[in-house]
Each structure stands twice: as structure tokens, then as C-alpha cells.
């Protein structure tokens, strides 16, 4: 459910939202770290209806969700958490 992407592409997000998205609507979360052509960290939420939302990394809810997912990743998360590098 949580993915970290390292990419040489420029920024993917044109507009960011801080609107809370309930866990039941989230398919996966992409984290695009700062650097490599984009000066800011980006978080992309893929919703189960196939739509994509760029989330403000400063939004309290997404920070909390990522922390919970990280904590659960070693034991009880029903959907695997994984990191993937994209060249």
C-alpha cells in the first residue's frame, strides 16, 4: 500500500490537496522523494476508483497514515508495504 519511488522525472504534481481520504478508498500511496528534478517531496494517492490525488505532504492525516503503515509493515498490515526503485 505504501511505495517509495526514486525517479529522474520532474515534479508529477501540479496541484496538491490536504483533503482527508478514508483508508477504505485508498489502493496505494506513492512517495516521490525530493530531488532528481523536483525540489519537493510528493505524495500520490491512488484511489480504488482509479483516480489519482496528489496530497500535501504537510497534511497531518497523510503523515499519520504513513507512520501507521510503516509501523504495521513488519507484522500486521493486510496489504504488503514495499519500496521500489524506478530508474
Amino acid at each position: 500500500v505504501l511505495e517509495v519511488y526514486y525517479t529522474s522525472l520532474r515534479c508529477r504534481c501540479v496541484q496538491e490537496s490536504s483533503v482527508f481520504i478514508p483508508r477504505r478508498f485508498i489502493d496505494r500511496i506513492q512517495i516521490l522523494p525530493r530531488g532528481n528534478g523536483c525540489p519537493r517531496k510528493e505524495i500520490i494517492v491512488w484511489k480504488k476508483n482509479k483516480s489519482i490525488v496528489c496530497v500535501d505532504p504537510q497534511a497531518e492525516w497523510i503523515q499519520r497514515m504513513m507512520e501507521v503503515l510503516r509501523k504495521r509493515s513488519s507484522s500486521t498490515l493486510p496489504v504488503p508495504v514495499f519500496k521500489r526503485k524506478i530508474p
Partner: antibody, heavy 120, light 107 residues
Amino acid sequence: EVQLVESGGGLVQPGGSLRLSCAASGIDFSRYWMSWVRQAPGKGLEWVAEINPEASSINYAPSLKDRFTISRDNAKNSLYLQMNSLRAEDTAVYYCARQDDYSHYTMDYWGQGTTVTVSS
Amino acid sequence: DIQMTQSPSSLSASVGDRVTITCKVSQDVNTGVAWYQQKPGKAPKLLIYSASYRYTGVPSRFSGSGSGTDFTFTISSLQPEDIATYYCQQYYSTPLTFGGGTKLEIK
């Protein structure tokens, strides 16, 4: 003005069936997740089921999923709840509610409710 | 299922009082909690969503706070028209669940 109007409630014997309807007006019905919520006499609120705009994703309260079926007809701006094998404990006011992404998928508009009484 | 433990189940307060209702959740629901007001014979009305966002048209005396497992709903100055039952609800994951309700009465 948003309006949700439930109908189809009434008195039914245990083991019987009912189909509730919710007619929506004043909204682009095909955009919204919709839910059914019920309230037994003198009791609290109990979520029954929800359905996404395309009817491709449906969730139920675990204790009800074998007997209740939620559906919708976007062309008719209508939401339905088929209730089978009814029991006395299903006696309640049944509300339909819209879930809006503006309010983060909470139930921001509710109908006035329709009463279902299961009794012999 | 996620359990919502709401307290108190009833309370009596005077006009102008500050009223606080709490909701404890059995597991982390982030900020996925809403608060509803229901008057006798009427459908519930959404007051607060995402723990602290006031819904359109809701008076500023109503507020909410919290995240994770502990949530609070406050009426800063109780008005006669606030007499109702208030419910918390988690919408983070299914099945959606409600608290047992808090019946608010005027002293």
C-alpha cells in the same frame, strides 16, 4: 435543494421481504457514494451498507450482508435496499444518506427515513 | 470491527455552559471521525467531519478535535436549540461504525 426521499417501508411478517427505495433530487446522483443507515426504536444509529457511483464497489455491515442487498439505478436517481429473511430485530427507521467527497465521504445529506416493522 | 465508545451516554447542562463529549476508538482511524446531531423524530445532521472540520452552515459554537483513537466534540456555549442526541462515527474503514450516542438535556 438536495432531497432524499425513502419509501417502501411497512409491516412485514418475520421471514418476509421488503424492498426500500430512495429517490434523489437536486443532486447529480451518479456522482455520489450512497449509504443506508438504520435506527431501531429508542436505539442508536447502525450503518447497513454503502455503494459507489458505478455500483462496482459495495460494502455491508457483516451481520447483514447475507440478507440485505444494496443497489442503485443512476438513470432513475434511485437507491435500493432489498431485505430478505426479515427478523424482529430488523424493525427500525431506515435512512438513505449521501456521502460527499467535499465532507471527506461523510454522510452530509439524509432522507427523512422510512419505517420497517417486522412482526407477526 | 472498529468500536466507538462514546461518553457520557447522557448529560444535563444549562444554557451557556460548555459541553464536551468524548469518543474513544478501538483502533487508529486517523482523522476519520464525524459528529452528527439528531433531534427527536428527525434524521441526523452532519456537524463535524474529519475530526475538526465544521460542515457548511454549522454554527461556530460546535467544534471537534482529535486524531488516532481519541476524539472530542465541544459546544462552547449551549443554546436551547442544541437539545438533541449526538453521535460520533468513524468512516476510516468498513464497516462504518457509530458511537452509542449522547443525549443532551437542558437543566
